[in-house]
């Protein structure tokens, strides 16, 4: 009789999850040679053990301990690009300036970035069919609670000046239910942080609004100086002459408004 | 069987651009990170740089910053490295190549090279 | 970059003899090197990585010590079939950096 099986909203662990990670890890090893003495194996057990035989919906940041512990990595704390709802120009960017880093340009980032992950309570087993959906099911499922662990643990490690780019297409440019509105912006740490800088990001064309003016990063703005945390936003009417002037700054076209 | 095959031997003029292929078969593409390599007439090797074909992420030897281009389709488990600005110089066997996860970051396969070379 | 300085340029050395080829880097690299075998008209082929580990299908009487500067690789007892040039190559850093390698000919 076949054993019944929870069906969860949301969509199955990646197909070749383990396969994925582990080499992933490898793979981050060969590109960044000061990380060579991280044992992916032991990175793939740990990761494995945070929700394999435990109930989906009831994930712990404690169960990821051992894979932060693995994960550790120091990367200069002045140089750390938050983004919401724009990740691919934010890696875009970190790929050109090269000193700067994202959440998924670390090891633990960059073993989950777009994967889906989760077990079944009392069996080893994955589950490929449905994994719990953050809204629908629960918010303690497996992604979720690695995502707000790491994401703290990424703004708690910020100095100096923090930037964090953002979606000017979205209704809610700063959006205080995404990770960076509802994790990183809190976990920033006064004593180190300076200033939070904002680079909103224009996706029109002929778009010449000042979007620092949209109400809702003068929330972000509000909660960040009650946090005691200088803010400062910028526009980036053109991204795609943004990240021209990030490689090549001596272009005569990259002093003026970008 | 794991397999790197590379496109043709190719003739250039000088300050022109040659892109060469290197199709991947026999494993996940994704999963590995892909080297180029280039070797002058009887000359050492020398290593250009790399791509990881999962996100399109590059690095490249200081050397060839401004005229190399690494890319990769992963519908085709294909990486190509693209040389612009030709001089004589540039007159090499180019090869891909990649570790095998389990021997280190040597580089365990090797495409059977791609001759280039650059005339006036 | 890293300095690879390999040792002879070349090396002449009668069948069934043992041959020895060196390998100095411009820094302490650990034991992040590979030695690899080079055939006229063939692509390289991976011997050694690691300093001291043989890759697969590598006969044992190849071998490397070394680590930090100074390595080498022994062939124990030469065979016709390997006459060729051997490489070093650090991946310790990028960019990664190779000898100017060894030609090893018959006596």
């Known amino acids: 009789v076949p054993r019944w099986r929870q069906q969860w909203s949301g969509p199955g662990t990646t197909k070749r999850f383990p396969e994925t990670v582990l080499a992933r890890c490898v793979k981050y090893t060969e590109i960044h040679p000061e990380m060579r003495h991280v044992d992916c194996q032991s990175v793939w057990d740990a990761f494995k053990g945070a929700f394999i035989s435990k109930h989906p919906c009831n994930i712990t940041e404690e169960d990821y301990q051992p894979l932060m512990k693995l994960g550790t990595q120091t990367v200069p704390c002045n140089k750390i690009l938050l983004w919401s709802r724009i990740k691919d120009l934010a890696h875009q960017f970190t790929q050109v300036q090269r000193d700067m880093f994202t959440l998924e340009d670390t090891l633990l980032g960059y073993l989950a970035d777009d994967l889906t992950w989760c077990g079944e309570f009392n069996t080893s087993k994955i589950n490929y069919q449905s994994c719990p959906d953050w809204r629908k099911d629960c918010s303690n499922n497996p992604v979720s609670v690695f995502w707000k662990t790491v994401s703290r643990r990424f703004a708690e490690a910020a100095c100096d000046v923090v930037h964090v780019m953002l979606n000017g297409s979205r209704s809610k440019i700063f959006d205080k239910n995404s990770t960076f509105g509802s994790v990183e912006v809190h976990n920033l740490q006064p004593e180190k942080v300076q200033t939070l800088e904002a680079w909103v990001i224009h996706g029109g064309r002929e778009d010449s609004r000042d979007l620092c003016q949209d109400p809702t990063i003068k929330e972000l703005e509000s909660i960040i100086s009650k946090r005691n945390i200088q803010f400062s936003c910028k526009n980036i009417y053109r991204p795609d002459k943004f990240l021209q002037c990030v490689k090549n700054p001596e272009d005569s076209s990259c002093t003026s408004e970008i | 069987q794991m397999q790197l095959v590379q496109s043709g031997a190719e003739v250039k003029k000088t300050g022109s651009s040659v892109k060469v292929s290197c199709k991947a078969s026999g494993y996940t593409f994704t999963d590995y990170i892909m080297h180029w390599v280039r070797q002058a007439p009887g000359q050492a090797l020398e290593w250009m740089g790399w791509?990881?074909?999962?996100?399109?992420?590059?690095d490249y030897a200081q050397k060839f910053q401004d005229r190399v281009t690494i890319t990769a389709d992963r519908s085709m488990s294909t990486a190509y490295m693209e040389l612009s600005s030709l001089r004589s110089e540039d007159t090499a066997m180019y090869y891909c190549?990649?570790?095998?996860?389990?021997?280190?970051?040597?580089?365990?396969?090797w495409g059977q090279g791609t001759l280039v070379t650059v005339s006036s | 970059e890293i300095v690879m300085t390999q040792s002879p340029a070349t090396l002449s050395v009668s069948p069934g003899e043992r041959a020895t080829l060196s390998c100095r880097a411009s820094?302490?690299?650990?034991?992040?090197l590979a030695w690899y075998q080079q055939k006229p008209g063939q692509a390289p082929r991976l011997l050694i990585y690691?300093?001291?580990s043989l890759a697969d299908g590598i006969p044992a009487r190849f071998s490397g010590s070394g680590s930090g500067t100074e390595f080498t690789l022994t062939i124990s007892s030469l065979q016709s079939e390997d006459f060729a040039v051997y490489y070093c190559q650090q991946y310790n850093n990028y960019p990664y950096t190779f000898g100017q390698g060894t030609k090893l000919e018959i006596k």
């Open positions: 820094e302490d690299i650990y034991s992040n």
């Open positions: 791509i990881d074909p999962e996100y399109g992420r590059t």
């Open positions: 690691d300093a001291n």
């Open positions: 190549a990649r570790s095998a996860h389990t021997t280190g970051f040597g580089f365990a396969y």
